[in-house]
């Protein structure tokens, strides 16, 4: 039922740059839908999910890839000032919806050179599955998002 007491990971990135976030989920949720969402008072507003969405807008700046084997990767590109806020990885798995990891994103003034800021998940150990296979489970194509 979520990671009790886990703090959001604070990430700072300049305008125009990108971030790469990795979230870990339980192997038994390999086929479950994964969601990257932005926290509002009402809850977490989905931005992108692992379900195939052929209606995705051409100008989308957030991409989610389910790498399989318990690893989810989210990339937010061409960051703008209005992207500052609270985000989370969520899985709608066997135990119901769970927040895997929270990220607090601060946007800084633009840098000279654009760069990608990489970030890992605090949830790694909490959601590792010692009984899982050593070989990563490669999800089928329709479990991956299509940018």
């Amino acid at each position: 039922q979520g990671i009790v007491g886990s703090l959001p990971e604070v990430l700072q990135a300049p305008v125009g740059s990108s971030i790469l976030v990795q979230c870990h989920y339980r192997l038994q949720d390999v086929k479950a839908q994964k969601v990257w969402c932005r926290f509002l008072p009402e809850g977490c507003q989905p931005l992108v999910s692992s379900a195939v969405d052929r209606r995705a807008p051409a100008g989308r700046r957030t991409f989610l890839t389910d790498l399989g084997g318990g690893l989810l990767q989210v990339e937010m590109v061409t960051l703008q000032e209005e992207d500052a806020g609270e985000y989370g990885c969520m899985v709608d798995g066997a135990r119901g919806p769970q927040i895997l990891h929270r990220v607090s994103l601060n946007i800084l003034p633009p840098e000279e050179e654009e760069e990608t800021h990489k970030i890992g998940s605090l949830a790694e150990n909490a959601f590792s599955d010692p009984a899982g296979s050593a070989n990563p489970l490669e999800p089928s194509q329709d479990e991956k998002s299509i940018p």
Partner: antibody
Framework: QVQLEQSGAELVRPGVSVKISCKGS????????MHWVKQSHAKSLEWIGV????????RYNQKFKGKATMTVDKSSSTAYMALARLTSEDSAIYYC??????????????WGQGTLVTVSA | SIVMTQTPKFLLVSAGDRVTITCKAS??????VAWYQQKPGQSPKLLIN???SRYTGIPDRFTGSGYGTDFTFTISTVQAEDLAVYFC?????????FGGGTKLEIE
């Protein structure tokens, strides 16, 4: 199972304030936002506002700004709502309510039992 | 604010009757409408969300339909335990608003 347990009925004098509580159990409290709803004979059901139980961010119905203040205590899995400068128009049943989803949605599958606030001199 | 106008306010029916309640939004709310049942002395209970999806465990005699501004809630065969007040609600935009309620009485 999900339960929202509210504090007991309040009989208060006009002009004073009251603070009612809503304790969530049977789920991860900080994963789900908490809403507050007023029910009175005159106005049916009215949405007061919502608070993020993790971040403490709030969104109020403009009508209740200055009247209601929502807070949360994560350590006790309890949401609170204070009502200020009470008048007879504030006499009502107040409910806390929770959506069934972590994602955004303001329809309510879980309700507290309600707290009756009566304002009387 | 979006106003949800619910009609009728009262319904007197017999067991076995078909009942229809309507809700009209003052502007389009897509399909972001829920319907609730509130029995005397109880908290409201969610019956329908997304205008037409029955919530978990809700009997199939309760149905909802509509999109945009016009929504309908139907009880196909009223039973004695359906005595209650029924409310519509939009969660399309804040402030989230409810209809005035329909009191269903069984004769």
């Amino acid at each position: 199972q999900v339960q929202l347990e509210q504090s007991g009925a309040e009989l208060v004098r006009p002009g004073v304030s009251v603070k009612i509580s809503c304790k969530g159990s049977g789920y991860t409290f900080t994963d789900y936002s908490m809403h507050w709803v007023k029910q009175s004979h005159a106005k049916s059901l009215e949405w007061i506002g919502v608070i993020s139980t993790y971040y403490g961010d709030v969104r109020y119905n403009q009508k209740f700004k200055g009247k209601a203040t929502m807070t949360v205590d994560k350590s006790s899995s309890t949401a609170y709502m204070a009502l200020a400068r009470l008048t007879s128009e504030d006499s009502a049943i107040y409910y806390c309510a929770r959506a069934p989803m972590i994602t955004t949605g303001a329809w309510f599958a879980y309700w507290g039992q309600g707290t009756l606030v009566t304002v009387s001199a | 604010s979006i106003v949800m106008t619910q009609t009728p306010k009262f319904l007197l029916v017999s067991a076995g009757d078909r009942v229809t309640i309507t809700c009209k939004a003052s502007q389009s709310v897509s399909n972001d409408v829920a319907w609730y049942q509130q029995k005397p002395g109880q908290s409201p209970k969610l019956l329908i969300n997304y205008a037409s999806s029955r919530y978990t465990g809700i009997p199939d005699r309760f149905t909802g339909s509509g999109y945009g501004t016009d929504f309908t809630f139907t009880i196909s065969t009223v039973q004695a335990e359906d005595l209650a007040v029924y409310f519509c609600q939009q969660d399309y935009s804040s402030p989230y608003t409810f209809g005035g309620g329909t009191k269903l009485e069984i004769e």
